[in-house]
Structures are given as structure tokens and as C-alpha cells.
């Protein structure tokens, strides 16, 4: 086995090119200089290396950078990123959004892997907060990203970043998360008026207190049932029948189809039957 550690005559790699796909694993180990690999990482993706060969290339980089890869190398990892462990990634210092995008692109179409989760965590912690451009990027790749964060993590989202959030990004958020995001959305959109404001704030109303719902009920907003069903039960319960009727407008008829589901079910039970009857929907308290 000893002779395999020396590079055969004439096989020393001068550059990273397609000829290397014919190298055995031990030849790659012996004949490819790690520093050369690091400077020509951008070429690796264009070459159809096997997984075993990629393991060798990763090993060479690991030896060259035992404390973690520099960003100049990380940005060009491409498919080699899939070979990285969360432990490897924790050694990195990724500060460029371009680097983040390049690596997320490699994992595109797949569930968020532990590697990607670690990468994002490192990136966000390095930046100190989840700024708008980062949030834009992350939600583009992973629409559920925002709702994967804890309320504590969400508290570091600056209100200005809320402009990047699309309704579908909030689909899987629970009430505790929306409790954190709602005041940020109110701050972000506070200079908007009328229906424009309501359209923007609507997705965040799952974090709204009763007082805000009461105020909206007096302003002809015609909230749709999908939004109403996502409201906090404790925020809906104090609303009167008249307030719910005004809040939903023409959508009030949809209450009948939802009468067995929260928060509608719990709200119905709190109302006087005489009041419910004024809706003419046959709701039974």
C-alpha cells in the first residue's frame, strides 16, 4: 500500500479538469494539491466526479483548512456542500449573502437538511439579525423558514424585514410565533392606509389582540373566513355577535360551515342564543 501514496510519474495535476475523473481515489489523494483545489473550486462542479472522489477532495480541503474553510472556498463548494456535516459547517464564518445563495441553490427542491439548517444558523448569527435581504432569500428557498424559528429567534427579526414576508410564509406559524410577528408587522406597515394596510396585515392577524379586532370590525374590512379561522381563540371569544358580523361582512355566512371548528365553536358557545339567531345561520350555542 505504501507505493500508492506517491503520485505516479506524469500524473501530477496541474489544474482541476475532466482528466481527473479517471483518477482512482488514491491517485486523487496523491496527485491533487490541496492548495490548487482550493483556488480552482469553481471548476469542481463542472466535472462529473463520483461520490467517492468527492470524499477524497473534501478530505484534502479538511487537511488544508482544519479550522474551517475560508469563504472564498465555501462560495464555490457546489455539490461538495452535500458532503459537509453540520460539524464541518459550524467551523465556517459565512458573511456573504451570495455564498449563502450559492449553497442553498445546491440543496434546492429538497427539505431543509441539518447541513442547511446549520449554515443558516451560522449566517444569521454572524449578521446579528435576520435582515430583509436574508429573509427574502431564505423564504424564497424555504417558504416555511420563518415558522421554523422559535419565538425567541423571531424576536431578532427587525420590522423592516417584514416587508419580505409573503402570506404563504406564515402558513405553518403557530399563535406564539404570530404573537411575536404581529407587533413587528404593525410597526412595518404603520404608514399605510385603508385596504392596502389591511391586505398587508391580514396574514399576521393570528397574533392580534381583541382590541384590534374590535377596531377593525368598525371599518368595513370584510375579513375572509380563512383569516378568521387563524385568529387567536382568546382574542375572538370577547367579540360580540354584532362585532363578528361587521368584521366578516358578507363572509359571515361561512360561520355555519366552520361551526364545529375553533375558534368559531368556542365563540358560539359564549354567545346568547338570541344574538346568534340574528345572524339567521342556524348556529346553536
Amino acid at each position: 500500500e505504501v507505493e500508492k501514496t506517491a503520485c505516479p510519474s506524469g500524473k501530477k495535476a496541474r489544474e482541476i479538469d475532466e482528466s481527473l475523473i479517471f483518477y482512482k481515489k488514491w491517485e486523487l489523494e496523491a496527485c491533487v494539491d490541496a492548495a490548487l483545489l482550493a483556488t480552482q473550486m469553481d471548476r469542481v462542479n463542472a466535472i462529473p466526479f463520483t461520490y467517492e472522489q468527492l470524499d477524497v477532495l473534501k478530505h484534502k480541503l479538511d487537511e488544508l483548512y482544519p479550522q474551517g474553510y475560508p469563504e472564498s472556498v465555501i462560495q464555490h463548494l457546489g455539490y461538495l456542500f452535500l458532503k459537509m456535516s453540520p460539524e464541518d459547517i459550524r467551523k465556517w464564518n459565512v458573511t456573504s449573502l451570495e455564498t449563502l445563495k450559492a449553497l442553498l441553490e445546491v440543496n434546492k427542491g429538497h427539505e431543509m437538511s441539518p447541513q442547511v439548517a446549520t449554515l443558516i444558523d451560522r449566517f444569521v448569527k454572524g449578521r446579528g439579525q435576520l435582515d430583509k435581504d436574508t429573509l427574502d432569500t431564505l423564504t424564497a428557498f424555504y417558504p416555511g423558514y420563518l415558522c421554523s424559528l422559535s419565538p425567541e429567534e423571531l424576536s431578532s427579526v427587525p420590522p423592516s424585514s417584514i416587508w419580505a414576508v409573503r402570506p404563504q410564509d406564515l402558513d405553518t406559524c403557530d399563535p406564539r410565533q404570530l404573537d411575536v410577528l404581529y407587533p413587528k408587522a404593525r410597526l412595518a406597515f404603520q404608514n399605510m392606509n385603508g385596504s392596502e394596510y389591511f391586505v398587508k396585515i391580514q396574514s399576521f392577524l393570528g397574533g392580534a389582540p381583541t382590541e384590534d379586532l374590535k377596531a377593525l370590525s368598525q371599518q368595513n374590512v370584510s375579513m375572509d373566513l380563512a383569516t378568521f379561522m387563524k385568529l387567536r381563540t382568546d382574542a375572538v371569544l370577547p367579540l360580540t355577535v354584532a362585532e363578528v358580523q361587521k368584521l366578516l361582512g358578507p363572509h359571515v355566512e361561512g360561520l355555519k360551515a366552520e361551526e364545529r371548528h375553533r375558534p368559531v365553536r368556542d365563540w358560539i358557545l359564549r354567545q346568547r342564543q338570541d344574538d346568534l339567531d340574528t345572524l339567521g345561520l342556524g348556529l346553536q350555542g
Epitope: N193, Y197, E211, D212, A215, Q218, Q219
Partner: nanobody, 131 residues
């Protein structure tokens, strides 16, 4: 949630002046309204003056126009303060004065000082004007 605490009330002779203050804590946003209301013994609560926090709108009851001035919110760290400057006071201005807020106003006009629209209220401060 918004907490409102009024101060500055007291007794004054007709023709005198008072300045009421309302210290607001909690989340205040530009698209909220704040206002002053009053309630004389045996009478219903009525609107006095109101303002859209984001600016560009104030509204006064006819009975106080030209005498009372509601000032824009002054912000100082976590505390924000609303003022009502009351000049040329009359005995009929005697009442308990309340500071109130509307948590969301989709339009500035919604800030008109109509009691049923306002959903946060302070405890009130007494103003007595003697002749």
C-alpha cells in the same frame, strides 16, 4: 396593549387655562388614534378632540374649537405623551376628562372623537371650572 394615565386636572376660575397630559405606554403605531373625551355628572361621555398619531388629522368638538388644542404625541423612550391645552375655560367644561386610543385606524377620518370607536381608556382626571 396600551396603558393610558391622565394627569393635569384641577380647579380653575372661568377664563383660566389647564394643560392635561396623557402618558401612554405599550405599543403605539402611526396608524392609531388618540383623543380626549369628557363626562359631566349625569351626562353621557362625549368627544372633545382627537388626533391621528401619524399626523395630518385633528378633530375638535364644536364646543371647544378655538379654545382647546390637542398636540401631536411627544415620544421619549418607551413613554409617549399626548397633551390637551385648554384655554378660556368655562363652567360648562367641568367634567371628568379621559384619554383614549383606537388601536387601528385604516383611515385618518376614523379618528373622529366618537366614544364607541375608542377601545383603550384611561382612568380620567377631574377638571372643575368655577365662575
Amino acid at each position: 396593549q396600551v396603558q393610558l394615565v391622565e394627569s393635569g386636572g384641577g380647579s380653575v376660575q372661568a377664563g383660566g387655562s389647564l394643560r392635561l397630559s396623557c402618558a401612554a405606554s405599550g405599543n403605539l403605531y402611526n396608524n392609531m388614534c388618540m383623543g380626549w373625551f369628557r363626562q359631566a355628572p349625569g351626562k353621557e361621555r362625549e368627544g372633545v378632540a382627537s388626533i391621528y398619531i401619524g399626523g395630518g388629522y385633528t378633530n375638535y368638538a364644536d364646543s371647544v374649537k378655538g379654545r382647546f388644542t390637542i398636540s401631536p404625541i411627544s415620544r421619549d423612550n418607551a413613554k409617549s405623551t399626548l397633551y390637551l391645552q385648554m384655554n378660556s375655560l368655562k363652567p360648562e367644561d367641568t367634567a371628568m376628562y379621559y384619554c383614549a386610543a383606537v388601536s387601528i385606524a385604516l383611515t385618518r377620518e376614523f379618528c373622529a372623537p366618537i366614544v364607541s370607536r375608542y377601545n383603550y381608556w384611561g382612568q380620567g382626571t377631574q377638571v372643575t371650572v368655577s365662575s
